[in-house]
Interface confidence: medium
């Protein structure tokens, strides 16, 4: 990844901090649990333009919806090493493009206002977002070699404890927009036709918390609502995730305490913020917005299927590009017929509505959404159609 030197890690952090925007989205179903649903207002939609959705390493939606304490909209990415170099993105065709390291978006897109915790419940219709087992390299406390672009929520403390890998599957939005995690529909998996139904071999990562529960590994995405679907469980949860539909939990995380500390670190990691992290384009111009979908869908090794997305825990310094024994693939790639294939290449229509698929190192697949006069697309995979009228309203 070509790195552009930045003054310091702090500087880099600042640069990125202003680049992520949490879009608040409420899940109607959330009301059922008696929890306040965040308004429909898309605070970061003020930027009209192409939107990029990123499917990061495996972060699970699991506890993503578990936010009970107000979550501040500020978030920042953590990149490899102190310098936040440019991020190399590969277009679906294979052409590598370098995204500016400083993905800054207008402050307004930052949605810095504290949003009430929206604990959306996945209103899955047909797809299963259950937790999936992911194979992910386990790394000790120290930063792993490959640090997936993580979105860290600033809960008010000077040091952001909770980390949300760029996960966007669990957008707390109306049921119609909820993503069901069951992405690789074409894959065979045990017990379910196109569901990648088996757990990947090892823990994956899912940082979004559906409710107040612990997270689970992510799996692949499947089209749950309409024709769009997040990664399936294997990619959602670091472990054996049974949430292929991006199922979210209902528990109120309010009464949940973090053992030994009272900090919200774990809880927040579990929660899927009511807002979705958005990465602003390096130019910071409203015309180019990248939507980063946390690595909620960590593609883990799915025993019953031929596709494995993530390495298993226990390989802290393992490069995801290739896997040990050739069983693991780099983030954004899946093992297909014995070789690692780009999600973009494997699933030509991964990005809907004409969106262009890109692979970003250490993050995964991103969709750069189409923008037309008066109409543009948004969402992790450009699945939603937005009009200027809707944005203004």
């Amino acid at each position: 990844v070509p790195a552009r030197e930045t003054g310091s890690a702090i500087e880099a952090e600042e640069l990125v901090r202003s680049s992520l925007a949490w879009e608040s989205r409420a899940n109607d179903t959330r009301e059922e649990a008696g929890l306040p649903a965040a308004g429909e207002d898309e605070t970061s939609w003020t930027e009209r333009g192409s939107e990029m959705a990123a499917v990061g390493p495996g972060v699970g939606p699991e506890e993503a919806l578990e936010a009970s304490a107000a979550v501040t909209g500020t978030a920042w990415l953590e990149a490899d090493g102190p310098g936040l170099g440019g991020v190399t993105a590969e277009a679906g065709s294979g052409d590598a493009q370098t995204l500016p390291a400083t993905l800054q978006a207008p402050d307004e897109a930052l949605g810095s206002s504290t949003m009430p915790p929206a604990i959306p419940e996945a209103t899955e219709t047909s797809g299963p977002p259950s937790p999936a087992v992911h194979d992910k390299p386990s790394v000790g406390p120290e930063l792993p070699k490959e640090i997936p672009l993580e979105v860290r929520l600033n809960l008010g403390g000077s040091t952001p404890e909770p980390t949300f890998p760029l996960q966007g599957t669990l957008e707390t939005q109306p049921a119609s927009d909820i993503i069901d995690i069951d992405y690789f529909e074409g894959l065979d998996s045990e017990g379910r036709g196109a569901d990648m139904g088996s757990f990947p071999g090892s823990p994956g990562t899912s940082e979004n918390h559906p409710d107040t529960e612990g997270e689970t590994p992510s799996w692949s995405l499947l089209d749950l609502y309409d024709d769009f679907t997040p990664f399936d469980e294997s990619d959602f949860y670091p472990t054996t995730s049974f949430y292929d539909d991006l199922e979210e939990e209902e528990e109120e995380e309010e009464d949940k305490d973090t053992v030994g500390g009272g900090d919200l670190e774990d809880e927040n990691d579990l929660l899927l913020p009511s807002q979705k992290p958005g990465v602003g384009p390096g130019t910071g111009q409203p015309t180019n917005r990248w939507h980063a979908v946390p690595p909620q869908h960590t593609l883990g090794m799915v025993p019953g299927s031929s596709i494995s997305l993530r390495p298993r825990p226990g390989d802290p310094g393992k490069d995801l590009a290739s896997g040990e024994n050739g069983t693991e693939c780099r983030v954004g790639f899946v093992r297909h017929n014995g070789s690692c294939r780009s999600v973009c290449d494997l699933f030509p229509s991964y990005c809907h509505n004409g969106g262009q698929c890109y692979l970003v190192e250490n993050i995964g697949a991103f969709c750069r959404c189409n923008t037309q006069d008066y109409i543009w697309h948004k969402g992790m995979r450009c699945e939603s159609i937005i009009t200027d009228f809707q944005v203004m309203c």
Partner: antibody, heavy 118, light 113 residues
Amino acid sequence: EVQLLESGGGLVQPGGSLRLSCAASGFTFSSYAMSWVRQAPGKGLEWVSAISGSGGSTYYADSVKGRFTISRDNSKNTLYLQMNSLRAEDTAVYYCAKTKPNNAFDYWGQGTLVTVSS
Amino acid sequence: DIVMTQSPDSLAVSLGERATINCKSSQSVLYSSNNKNYLAWYQQKPGQPPKLLIYWASTRESGVPDRFSGSGSGTDFTLTISSLQAEDVAVYYCQQTATQPLTFGQGTKVEIK
């Protein structure tokens, strides 16, 4: 209040079949993955199977793969476990459990005893 | 499969004293992407189903008394009951929730001395 109630257990001969049911209430059933966990008399816990909220994905322990089938009817808020080709070693109390996204089981039913004996 | 091994098999502690249960996994259950340890602890009292106490190695489930705490990372974990109460007499299980199949430790029986 979350409640899980298993039923369908009983005495069955080796090679026989049995279908367990788990009626769920108190939460949005279709939004959660569900699992079956069993516990042989005087023994520890063993995860048996799991199913995603939509029912699209299913998972099994090697010990029951090919013999047990997990399913769910979200319209009835019910989880099922069809057990075929039962063996003596399948004798246990079977619990259905609501599964958190991190795969931990936060709510368990009281369990139903399955005895496989000739 | 990840093998979970608990120690000791049984533990007798005086009321009000600290009880410590260890759990070791054959493979790391820590995920670098979210720095979470996919490990849970359960309490099972005689004739009852298990009850989730802690997940992610150290996060208490709602309603669980704060005398229960979990710690550890990677492959070594500990469940601590800071001040044992009579109602804490039970069998405690650790479970790795990181990979399929989900596996449990053999259990540790905690009794009053």
